[in-house]
């Protein structure tokens, strides 16, 4: 399990994984856009076994999953998506 925490640069991900996680095992996804002291986009995944992982935003599977979730956004999302709030 990769550690996720706030750094002095306000980036939260120390390492990123590109390993596929099936949607059924994902509790929620947090998307943190570039900015607010962090120079890169970050995606944090909370899994159903209570572990947390940072996912490489360039990983094909997470891009596909986010696209599916965006298409479903008109109805209730099975996986809540949260975005970074920029003050």
């Amino acid at each position: 399990v990769l550690e996720v925490y706030y750094t002095s640069l306000r980036c939260r991900c120390v390492q990123e994984s590109s390993v596929f996680i099936p949607r059924r095992f994902i509790d929620r996804i947090q998307i943190l856009p570039r900015g607010n002291g962090c120079p890169r986009k970050e995606i944090i995944v909370w899994k159903k076994n209570k572990s947390i992982v940072c996912v490489d935003p360039q990983a094909e599977w997470i891009q596909r999953m986010m696209e599916v979730l965006r298409k479903r956004s008109s109805s209730t999302l099975p996986v809540p998506v949260f975005k970074r709030k920029i003050p």
Epitope: V19, I21, P22, R23, R24, F25, T76, P78
Partner: antibody
Framework: EVQLVESGGGLVQPGGSLRLSCAAS????????MAWVRQAPGKGLEWVAS????????YYRDSVKGRFTISRDNAKNSLYLQMNSLRAEDTAVYYC??????????????WGQGTLVTVSS | DIQMTQSPSSLSASVGDRVTITCKAS??????LTWYQQKPGKAPKRLIY???ILQTGIPSRFSGSGSGTEYTLTISSLQPEDFATYFC????????FGQGTKLEIK
């Protein structure tokens, strides 16, 4: 041809332990999530546990958390289920199943023939 | 946790009949549903996945449909080998099977 062969079932007393094995062949084992599913005599199917490609991520149904441990050995193409503190309600045929490849089209596709676990005094 | 309610629990029908089995989910499962056939003493056999995709080698008399929380398996013209127990499986959030439908000869 995909083949899954379970072993290790048997009669065990309540509170006892058992380790189930599943030998896989005919596919690239390390490319798949794997799962254990059980079926009590004359009853329905019940998902027990799942494991990711390298064994680093595991998931369990609430009733077995802390008692059962799913693991795998990709070098041996084998899946395992260590069952501790067994209860009468764990009595079932236990199946291993391929669970997930990248696009999700192989969810619970191939199953073994099952191995019977009986928990009784 | 998502609950799956399958109905009917048992069904008597004759060869040639059209049969429909239903599964209702306690919440939207986004078509992430699989149907299985099981015969006594055998492992389940996958018939349909992702609601309506027929497994390779499964006869076209089997079909699936549905969306949101309601899903159906239809056998258009029952054959003798179709008498078995059928289960649905949701794979949207972990896994939950339906209780099963035993299809018997009338």
């Amino acid at each position: 041809e995909v083949q899954l062969v379970e072993s290790g079932g048997g009669l065990v007393q309540p509170g006892g332990s058992l380790r189930l094995s599943c030998a896989a062949s005919g596919f690239t084992f390390s490319d798949y999530y794997m799962a254990w599913v059980r079926q009590a005599p004359g009853k329905g199917l019940e998902w027990v546990a799942s494991i990711n490609y390298d064994g680093g991520d595991t998931y369990y149904r609430d009733s077995v958390k802390g008692r059962f441990t799913i693991s795998r050995d990709n070098a041996k193409n084998s899946l395992y289920l260590q069952m501790n503190s067994l209860r009468a309600e764990d009595t079932a045929v236990y199946y291993c199943a391929t669970e997930e490849d990248y696009d999700g089209s192989y969810v619970m596709d191939a199953w073994g023939q099952g191995t019977l676990v009986t928990v009784s005094s | 946790d998502i609950q799956m309610t399958q109905s009917p629990s048992s069904l008597s029908a004759s060869v040639g009949d059209r049969v429909t089995i239903t599964c209702k989910a306690s919440q939207n499962i986004n078509k992430e549903l699989t149907w299985y056939q099981q015969k006594p003493g055998k492992a389940p056999k996958r018939l349909i996945y992702n609601t309506n995709i027929l497994q390779t080698g499964i006869p076209s008399r089997f079909s699936g449909s549905g969306s949101g929380t309601e899903y159906t398996l239809t056998i258009s013209s029952l054959q003798p080998e179709d008498f078995a127990t059928y289960f649905c499986l949701q794979q949207s959030s972990l896994y939950t099977f339906g209780q099963g439908t035993k299809l018997e000869i009338k």
